[in-house]
Interface confidence: medium
């Protein structure tokens, strides 16, 4: 119930300049970047420019359920997956399957999450257990980031305000704060 089927609705993103968050560790640890062969231009050409806005990457929508143990969200949530490849905008067609991917031989440009949105979801549990609510942070947009050899694994896992994590902060529904209500939640929290 994790990674659902992707819709084929890639969107080309022209990134802005400035600070970029780090890619999520799951992209770094266990997933191979989908790098294709050289698109035909000399490899040095587009990567000598200083203008990051010349590069773009893809946003792929995917749908999944939020789960916690046996509990699952009543409805799936939809967020973006940022594809691992960045290249000159003119070489990245807006539809999957057209044109050629650019394979840079210079600095590595990675397509990573940029902005997030928060969404509260209701989790339904089996066996008569009370529903749980969670507040998840979902990727809302992507951007390109230039990675250098100094971006080691630990740096790629630093999660800040806009750090690249699909979810953050488990947040159950608002609750009363009386001792009795508090105890009831302790008994039903999971």
């Amino acid at each position: 119930q994790g990674w659902q089927a992707f819709k084929n609705d890639a969107t080309e993103i022209i990134p802005e300049l400035g600070e970029y968050p780090e890619p999520p560790p799951e992209l770094e640890n266990n997933k191979t970047m989908n790098r294709a062969e050289n698109g035909g231009r000399p490899p040095h050409h587009p990567f000598e420019t200083k203008d990051v806005s010349e590069y773009s990457c893809r946003e792929l929508h995917f749908t999944r359920y939020v789960t916690d143990g046996p509990c699952r969200s009543a409805k799936p949530v939809t967020e973006l997956v940022c594809s691992g490849q960045c290249g000159p905008a003119r070489l990245l067609p807006n539809a999957i399957g057209r044109g050629k991917w650019w394979r840079p031989s210079g600095p590595d440009f990675r397509c990573i999450p940029d902005r997030y949105r928060a969404q509260r979801v209701q989790l339904l549990c089996p066996g008569g257990e009370a529903p749980r609510a969670r507040k998840v942070r979902l990727v809302a947009s992507c951007k390109c980031k230039r990675l250098t050899r100094f971006h080691n694994q630990s740096e790629l896992k630093d999660f800040g305000t806009e750090a690249a994590r699909p979810q953050k902060g488990r947040k159950p529904r608002p609750r009363a704060r009386s001792a009795k209500a508090n105890q009831a939640e302790l008994e039903n929290a999971y």
């Epitope: 560790p25 507040k135 750090a163 929290a189």
Partner: antibody, heavy 125, light 108 residues
Amino acid sequence: EVQLVQSGAEVKKPGASVKVSCKASDFNIKDFYLHWVRQAPGQGLEWIGRIDPENGDTLYDPKFQDKVTMTTDTSTSTAYMELRSLRSDDTAVYYCAREADYFHDGTSYWYFDVWGRGTLVTVSS
Amino acid sequence: DIQMTQSPSSLSASVGDRVTITCSVSSTISSNHLHWFQQKPGKAPKSLIYGTSNLASGVPSRFSGSGSGTDFTLTISSLQPEDFATYYCQQWSSYPLTFGGGTKVEIK
């Protein structure tokens, strides 16, 4: 740098109250639960409770229900924990910690990914 | 409350040794709810492993975790000087959250 910055050490008399602060740096405090954990000298870790800074919702370990009050001020990205009716056995280092929710390979995880450096509260007559 | 029992409570080892710490849980929990922390004297705990076997940010690969149900293990394949510390397991299966009593790893 993502961090939780806690207030300095306190020395209090028995029966007094103390308010410890925990300021979030470089992340949106409303996106996370903040928890408080204490550690008496030479002892292990003990969970006190947590607060949702977004709406002030709290959950305490029942044994601390009458001892603590957790609050937040989102305008300053700061969480507070007030300890009342202090006794000598409340002497401990009090830590705040951020609860992170991480989705990976189809599984969700919740764990403390960032901790404050701790605030030593000494209760002595 | 779920009780967490760590063993041993302390151990002496040398650099290069393989060290194993166990955490026994009083009731069955999901593997994604079991975490390990490292704490050095005068410092805050540091996340080491989350969800039984996933290394937290910046944690060396000599650390590993395993287990399921009620029995979980933290292993340090080759102890390094900076690994001498106290290690805690913690469950997130139900409130109140609880920690193991800790295992102090000392230099032999």
